[in-house]
C-alpha cells in the first residue's frame, strides 16, 4: 500500500486490479449505446479528465526514484472517474442494466483507489469539477467519451503497475 513516507504499494495486487479495470472498461464501452459520433462536440465534463503525462514520474526511471508522484497522479484519476461514474451521467436515463459492467467498473475504481490510499493517509486530490446536472439526451455521448478516456487512463495505469510488480516489488 502507498503510505506516508513513500513506502511501496502492493504492486502485484495493484497490477491485478488494474488489469481487471482494463477488461471492465473495454467491456463497458460498447454497452453505453451505439453512437453516431458525427454529432460529437466538446463537452465540459470530459475536457478536464486526468491524463498521465511525461512529468508525472510514471516512466521507469521516475518510478525507481520516487513512485509516490506517479501513484498520487493515478489515485487522483481513479477518484475523478469514480465520481463521474456515480454522477447522473451514469445513474440517470437511459438506465444502465442492473448487471452492467459499469457497476463493476465503478466498484473496482474505488477498490484500487483505496488500495493506493488507505484510511488515515490523505493525498491532496485534484479538484473534482462540480458536475452540473446533465440533460438526459447528452448522457449517451458523455458516457461514450468518459469511458473512452477511462480506457486510455487505466491502460497506462496497468502498465505502471505491471512494471512495478516486475521490477519494484520487494
Amino acid at each position: 500500500r502507498a503510505v506516508p513516507g513513500g513506502s511501496s504499494p502492493a504492486w502485484t495486487q495493484c497490477q491485478q486490479l488494474s488489469q481487471k479495470l482494463c477488461t471492465l472498461a473495454w467491456s463497458a464501452h460498447p454497452l453505453v449505446g451505439h453512437m453516431d459520433l458525427r454529432e460529437e462536440g466538446d463537452e465540459e465534463t470530459t475536457n478536464d479528465v486526468p491524463h498521465i503525462q511525461c512529468g508525472d514520474g510514471c516512466d521507469p526511471q521516475g518510478l525507481r526514484d520516487n513512485s509516490q508522484f506517479c501513484l498520487q497522479r493515478i489515485h487522483q484519476g481513479l477518484i475523478f472517474y469514480e465520481k463521474l461514474l456515480g454522477s447522473d451521467i451514469f445513474t440517470g436515463e437511459p438506465s444502465l442494466l442492473p448487471d452492467s459492467p459499469v457497476g463493476q467498473l465503478h466498484a473496482s475504481l474505488l477498490g484500487l483507489s483505496q488500495l493506493l490510499q488507505p484510511e488515515g493517509h490523505h493525498w491532496e486530490t485534484q479538484q473534482i469539477p462540480s458536475l452540473s446536472p446533465s440533460q438526459p439526451w447528452q448522457r449517451l455521448l458523455l458516457r461514450f467519451k468518459i469511458l473512452r478516456s477511462l480506457q486510455a487512463f487505466v491502460a497506462v495505469a496497468a502498465r505502471v503497475f505491471a512494471h512495478g510488480a516486475a521490477t519494484l516489488s520487494p
Partner: antibody, heavy 115, light 113 residues
Framework: EVQLQQSGPELVKPGASVRMSCKAS????????IHWVKQKPGQGLEWIGY????????NYNENFKGKATLTSDKSSSTAYMELSSLTSEDSAVYYC????????WGQGTTLTVSS | DIVMSQSPSSLPVSVGEKVTMSCKSS????????????LAWSQQKPGQSPKLLIY???TRKSGVPDRFTGSGSGTDFTLTISSVKAEDLAVYYC?????????FGSGTKLEIK
C-alpha cells in the same frame, strides 16, 4: 420485486413544513435517480425534481426551488422530500418514481394543508 | 420548457374497440445519434398511482399487455390500444424526459361507453 414504499398521509397547518419518505427495495438504491412528482386533486402531473442517491446530487424544477428539498439516506435506501412554508396550493398527492425508463412509482403520499 | 399536448382530453370507447390517442411536443424528443425518442406513456387508474406502459416512445415495459403500442418520432406520438378492455379505463399521460424540467401532457381520459 422492485418497490417504492411511501410514507402515510399528512395533515398539516399552513406555514408549517413536512417531510415525506420513499423507501426503495428490490434493486440497488444508488443505481438510479429518484424523481418526485406532484398531482393536485383532479389534475395532471408536475415534475418536482430528482435526487441521485449515490452522491446526493439534486436537480429541481425552477417552480419548486425554495419549496422542496430532496435528500436521501443510503443506509436505509430511503429518499426524502421536505416541503416548507406550506399553503393550500401544496395540498396534493406526491409520488416518488425511479428513472422513467425503469418506471417504478411509489403509491403516493397525500398532503392536506388546512387550518 | 417543453410543452406536451395531448388529444383528445376525453375518449369514450366501447369494449373491444381500437383506440388511438395523440401526444405532441413543442420540440423534438429524438436524439438522432442514438435514434432514441425520450418519451414515455403512463396509465393512471382511478385512485391509483401512475404506471409506466411505454418508454423510448415504443418500448413496452415488461408485463404490459401487447394490446398497448407506442409509435411516433420527433414531435408526434401515438398510443394505440388494439382492443380495449374494461380494465383499461384510466387517464393516459405522455411525458418527456429529453430535457429538464421533465414535463407531462394533461392526459387523455379513456371512458367506457
Amino acid at each position: 420485486e422492485v418497490q417504492l414504499q411511501q410514507s402515510g398521509p399528512e395533515l398539516v397547518k399552513p406555514g408549517a413544513s413536512v417531510r415525506m419518505s420513499c423507501k426503495a427495495s428490490g434493486y440497488t438504491f444508488t443505481s438510479y435517480l429518484i424523481h418526485w412528482v406532484k398531482q393536485k386533486p383532479g389534475q395532471g402531473l408536475e415534475w418536482i425534481g430528482y435526487i441521485n442517491p449515490y452522491n446526493d446530487g439534486t436537480n429541481y424544477n425552477e417552480n419548486f426551488k425554495g419549496k422542496a428539498t430532496l435528500t436521501s439516506d443510503k443506509s436505509s435506501s430511503t429518499a426524502y422530500m421536505e416541503l416548507s412554508s406550506l399553503t393550500s396550493e401544496d395540498s396534493a398527492v406526491y409520488y416518488c418514481a425511479s428513472n422513467w425508463d425503469v418506471g417504478y412509482w411509489g403509491q403516493g403520499t397525500t398532503l392536506t394543508v388546512s387550518s | 420548457d417543453i410543452v406536451m399536448s395531448q388529444s383528445p382530453s376525453s375518449l369514450p370507447v366501447s369494449v373491444g374497440e381500437k383506440v388511438t390517442m395523440s401526444c405532441k411536443s413543442s420540440q423534438s424528443l429524438l436524439y438522432s445519434s442514438s435514434q432514441k425518442n425520450y418519451l414515455a406513456w403512463s396509465q393512471q387508474k382511478p385512485g391509483q398511482s401512475p404506471k409506466l406502459l411505454i418508454y423510448w416512445a415504443s418500448t413496452r415495459k415488461s408485463g404490459v399487455p401487447d394490446r398497448f403500442t407506442g409509435s411516433g418520432s420527433g414531435t408526434d406520438f401515438t398510443l394505440t390500444i388494439s382492443s380495449v378492455k374494461a380494465e383499461d379505463l384510466a387517464v393516459y399521460y405522455c411525458h418527456q424526459y429529453y430535457s429538464y424540467p421533465f414535463t407531462f401532457g394533461s392526459g387523455t381520459k379513456l371512458e367506457i361507453k
